[in-house]
């Protein structure tokens, strides 16, 4: 008996071939001997089966001695043994229809779980293997679960169902809802305008929800909500914003925030959360602000940084085109009695400059100028 595997919702062609390469009489029946379809001369005739409106054949193939049964919009309950009667012979084909569905929505938040459930006909014992977009394989029986979805799990999951040495492949598109970056850091000189961007790692036609940016300034004892906003069909509208700092927000995606000027009291780290409509849980992105200030007070030239810096970052003070006068893994460095000239304060990581501030030291009878 020939075995054919089908997918729920798909179309399948069950073949039946006669030795004579011409149009002759044929009938397709199910295991209960109920006629599905056949021919009367050149006309297609249909029986009283439940497949009536979903069964078809191809007249053009009859002349070649082929009498296919085509079943559209397959259902699990179409799994059966189908019998083709032609030339006083009977050809049996066992059709097994499988379905594979995601437990809930195929749009899942980062960190959530994905469960894939296999629908199969009674008496079958299939095995399932799925391959994620990043090449991770998972195996199982009727259900497969993946916990803690990551951004790289977004894309097409390819699942293979094996039964009777035959296989059928399912493709399921999964979208992991997340920000492109889990964390970002912005380095700014005091007084500069600060741009924070929160690009999403997915695109959907309609995006609705609400969000908030909480900020923990390095100098503050507790965190504070800087801004709350709504998102309706990808349009952003501000609900509430603090007076200090007075953030501005872009009206379109990607989410974009502007801080008019970087000040030491704003240095710190924030957490932007986005709650999406009809989704449990929130998307998060951490954002950090490091602010640099170079000053000269009397005979002391000082460079300071505020905000979350890693211990391996180097802060240096150097006269332009000269070796660093002072270089430390600290958040403040200074030079006493600096020579006149253009001084540079540099924050660097393994030789790569992250932030630079210049200050002009005038001869001692003048006051310093900050360009």
């Amino acid at each position: 008996k020939k075995v054919v595997l089908g997918k729920k919702g798909d179309t399948v062609e069950l073949t039946c071939t006669a030795s004579q390469k011409k149009s002759i009489q044929f009938h397709w029946k199910n295991s209960n001997q109920i006629k599905i379809l056949g021919n009367q001369g050149s006309f297609l005739t249909k029986g009283p089966s439940k497949l009536n409106d979903r069964a078809d054949s191809r007249r053009s193939l009859w002349d070649q001695g082929n009498f296919p049964l085509i079943i559209k919009n397959l259902k699990i309950e179409d799994s059966d043994t189908y019998i083709c009667e032609v030339e006083d012979q009977k050809e049996e084909v066992q059709l097994l229809v499988f379905g594979l569905t995601a437990n809930s929505d195929t749009h899942l938040l980062q960190g959530q779980s994905l469960t894939l459930t296999l629908e199969s006909p009674p008496g079958s014992s299939p095995s399932v293997q799925c391959r994620s977009p990043r090449g991770k394989n998972i195996q199982g029986g009727k259900t497969l679960s993946v916990s803690q979805l990551e951004l790289q799990d977004s894309g097409t999951w390819t699942c293979t169902v094996l039964q009777n040495q035959k296989k059928v492949e399912f493709k399921i598109d999964i979208v992991v809802l997340a920000f492109q970056k889990a964390s970002s850091i912005v380095y700014k000189k005091e007084g500069e305008q600060v741009e924070f961007s929160f690009p999403l790692a997915f695109t959907v036609e309609k995006l609705t929800g609400s969000g908030e940016l909480w900020w923990q300034a390095e100098r503050a004892s507790s965190s504070k909500s800087w801004i709350t906003f709504d998102l309706k069909n990808k349009e952003v509208s501000v609900k509430r914003v603090t007076q200090d700092p007075k953030l501005q927000m872009g009206k379109k995606l990607p989410l974009h925030l502007t801080l008019p000027q970087a000040l030491p009291q704003y240095a710190g780290s924030g957490n932007l959360t986005l709650a999406l409509e009809a989704k449990t849980g929130k998307l998060h992105q951490e954002v950090n602000l490091v602010v640099m200030r170079a000053t000269q007070l009397q005979k002391n030239l000082t460079c300071e940084v505020w905000g979350p810096t890693s211990p391996k970052l180097m802060l240096s003070l150097k006269l332009e085109n000269k070796e660093a006068k002072v270089s430390k893994r600290e958040k403040a460095v200074w030079v006493l009695n600096p020579e006149a000239g253009m001084w540079q304060c540099l924050l660097s990581d393994s030789g790569q400059v992250l932030l630079e501030s210049n200050i002009k030291v005038l001869p001692t009878w003048s006051t310093p100028v900050q360009p």
Epitope: E13, S42, D56, R58, R59, S60
Partner: antibody, heavy 115, light 107 residues
Framework: QVQLQQWGAGLLKPSETLSLTCAVY????????WSWIRQPPGKGLEWIGE???????NYNPSLKSRVTISVDTSENQFSLKLNSVTAADTAVYYC?????????WGQGTLVTVSS | EIQMTQSPSSVSASVGDRVTITCRAS??????LAWYQQKPGKAPNLLIF???SLQTGVPSRFSGSGSGTDFTLTISSLQPDDFATYYC?????????FGQGTNLGIK
């Protein structure tokens, strides 16, 4: 809802090979037959040939010697190659799905053969 | 090979008119016939299949009849959207073939 999207070179010189591809989105690929049909400017429709997911083909005898239709089930795509084209092969080429009737159709690709 | 012949090649009519287009097969094709509508610059669209079955989404003013070699497409009350070219197609045997088309224009 099934959609067919086709693409390929629109301008050819005589004796070159016409090559078109049709991608099937949002529906079953197996169980159906996938056809190519052409329509010269201002004229009627001519069936070129068909293929199913397992690669079984039927061609129009008038074009059989020059036509190859192939299938890529992993991408849900099928392709047409027509060798040794002449000005008489200038037409809008359509891909379509069928069991017995052509539905739906691709958007069509105008292929012009000119020296 | 089966030849399909449509008549008339072109017809002019007014909104509200009843229009009939015929298609003749060079040999018996039972009811293995479809009708398509094509508008300029667009792909054909299936209207009727198996000679008389209306395709989902097609207005009920379209109907098909016939069997064997002679078939008819009828538009009971012509609407502005119906001005187009109409083709019949046989699915009885390879190679599939189409009629030469009937251009339905505004009178």
């Amino acid at each position: 809802q099934v959609q067919l999207q086709q693409w390929g070179a629109g301008l050819l010189k005589p004796s070159e090979t016409l090559s078109l591809t049709c991608a099937v989105y949002g529906g079953s690929f197996s169980g159906y037959y996938w056809s190519w049909i052409r329509q010269p400017p201002g004229k009627g429709l001519e069936w070129i040939g068909e293929i199913n997911h397992s690669g079984s083909t039927n061609y129009n005898p008038s074009l059989k010697s020059r036509v190859t239709i192939s299938v890529d089930t992993s991408e849900n795509q099928f392709s047409l190659k027509l060798n040794s084209v002449t000005a008489a092969d200038t037409a809008v080429y359509y891909c379509a799905r069928l069991v017995n009737w052509f539905d739906p159709w691709g958007q069509g690709t105008l292929v012009t053969v000119s020296s | 090979e089966i030849q399909m012949t449509q008549s008339p090649s072109s017809v002019s009519a007014s909104v509200g008119d009843r229009v009939t287009i015929t298609c003749r097969a060079s040999q018996d094709i039972s009811n293995w016939l479809a009708w398509y509508q094509q508008k300029p610059g667009k792909a054909p669209n299936l209207l009727i299949f198996a000679a008389s079955s209306l395709q989902t989404g097609v207005p009920s003013r379209f109907s098909g009849s016939g069997s064997g070699t002679d078939f008819t497409l009828t538009i009971s009350s012509l609407q502005p959207d119906d001005f187009a070219t109409y083709y019949c197609q046989q699915a009885n045997s390879f190679p599939y073939s189409f009629g030469q088309g009937t251009n339905l224009g505004i009178k």
